[in-house]
């Protein structure tokens, strides 16, 4: 079997064997090595010498196999845009940002660039659970039967109605989607406007 060509090697068809780790250099019509993540090209390749790579300086990075002559500057997560840091910048990875709690991504350009406050869900509803936190605005859905939620909130969850009998009490008024069951002591009389509405 033929020995594997090691960069730099000639390429007549302008393609290289390993597209991820090699690139075509048109001036010399050769395939050269890319620099691994966390490094940059400190000296370009020639027919007799492969690419020379150097480590990115502090506060800079390159995420992919590359033939860049500089490293990208690390950028902080912009709190004014509603972003917070979840992982610091390293030589191999940019700063990882996400929307602050209670916010969602409103502008996306390869990554989130701007977050906005989640909409409140009105009483009787809750925010539908999403696969990914911060991915989109709240979509409010009604409380299921037997549950209630009595605030305007981006995060409040529907709670089950109180079962009066579990507390040794009786129901004075049934619960709705927006209010809990009202319980009372079984010995207490009903208020005048409710007399006759309770089954004994």
């Amino acid at each position: 079997s033929q020995p594997q060509a090691v960069p730099p090697y000639a390429s007549e068809n302008q393609t290289c064997r390993d597209q991820e780790k090699e690139y075509y250099e048109p001036q010399h019509r050769i395939c050269c090595s890319r620099c691994p993540p966390g490094t940059y090209v400190s000296a370009k390749c020639s027919r007799i010498r492969d690419t020379v790579c150097a480590t990115c300086a502090e506060n800079s990075y390159n995420e992919h196999w590359n033939y860049l002559t500089i490293c990208q500057l690390c950028r902080p997560c912009d709190p004014v845009m509603g972003l917070e840091e979840i992982a610091p910048c390293t030589s191999k990875r940019k700063t990882q940002c996400r929307c602050q709690p209670g916010m969602f991504c409103a502008a996306w350009a390869l990554e989130c660039t701007h977050c906005e406050l989640l909409s409140d869900c009105p009483p009787g509803t809750e925010a539908e659970l999403k696969d990914e936190v911060g991915k989109g605005n709240n979509h409010c859905v009604p409380c299921k039967a037997g549950h209630f939620q009595n605030t305007s909130s981006p995060s409040a969850r529907c709670q089950p109605h109180t079962r009066c009998e579990n507390q040794g009490l009786v129901e004075a008024a049934p619960g709705t989607a927006q209010s809990d069951t009202t319980c009372k002591n079984p010995l207490e009389p009903l208020p005048p406007e409710m007399s006759g509405t309770m089954l004994m």
Epitope: P122, L129, A145, Q178
Partner: antibody, heavy 128, light 107 residues
């Protein structure tokens, strides 16, 4: 023009199954909750089931809970109602309907405003 | 569950009459009340949402009012095409429920 077209109704024996479909057109199907309502012969309207736009949240009337399943396929703009363990009392015309969302409402909640568009209905008869 | 009660169950009226149908909820439902019209053999048609807001394309002779537990649908001047069944529906608390219907017929 917003259109809803139900299909899949028919005659089925008690205990049998049926799947109703509702093809939607003329609106962004993936943005709206959808509802099934039924009407037994000579009777009034009965709310059956509701599904959120994502399909992640579903609701059922007690009379069908555990037997019926509502679902949606956004790629096909279609709403479904899978009906199992059918009973004589499930005999009805089944309507699919699009939930209404008024333009002037600030808080995005599509559920409080009823439905604004109805399909023509499909008849389900459960009989031996 | 919230019960919806319509009255009257049936009603005879003449073209040009002013007609009122009422709907009562067993609990406070704020203004989450909708009205629908249905003609025999046809699908329902949406008339009013949020107790008093007219659906697009519905004639202005239809109006709705009320809040809490008591609601009304008013037709200011009956037209021949208005003879039909009318249903109210609450969308305050799951399960959403309909009234039993009001049959509006020609006198």
């Amino acid at each position: 023009e917003v259109q809803l077209l139900e299909s899949g109704g028919g005659l089925v024996q008690p205990g049998g199954s049926l799947r109703l479909s509702c093809a939607a057109a003329g609106f962004t199907f993936s943005s709206y909750p959808m509802t099934w309502v039924r009407q037994a012969p000579g009777k009034g309207l009965e709310w059956v089931s509701l599904i959120s736009p994502s399909g992640a949240t579903t609701y059922y009337a007690d009379s069908v809970k555990g037997r019926f399943t509502i679902s949606r396929d956004t790629s096909k703009n279609t709403l479904y109602l899978q009906m199992n363990s059918l009973r004589a009392e499930d005999t009805a015309v089944y309507y699919c309907a699009k939930n209404h969302y008024p333009d002037d409402v600030i808080i995005k909640n599509y559920y409080f405003y009823g439905v604004d568009v109805w399909g023509q209905g499909t008849t389900v008869t459960v009989s031996s | 569950d919230i019960q919806m009660t319509q009255s009257p169950s049936s009603l005879s009226a003449s073209v040009g009459d002013r007609v009122t149908i009422t709907c009562r909820a067993s609990q406070d439902i704020s203004n989450y009340l909708n009205w629908y019209q249905q003609k025999p053999g046809k699908a329902p048609k949406s008339l009013i949402y949020a107790a008093s807001s007219l659906q697009s394309g519905v004639p202005s002779r239809f109006s709705g009012s009320g809040s809490g537990t008591d609601f009304t649908l008013t037709i200011s001047s009956l037209q021949p095409e208005d003879f039909a069944n009318y249903y109210c529906q609450q969308t305050h608390t799951i399960p959403y429920s309909f009234g039993q219907g009001t049959n509006l017929e020609i006198k």
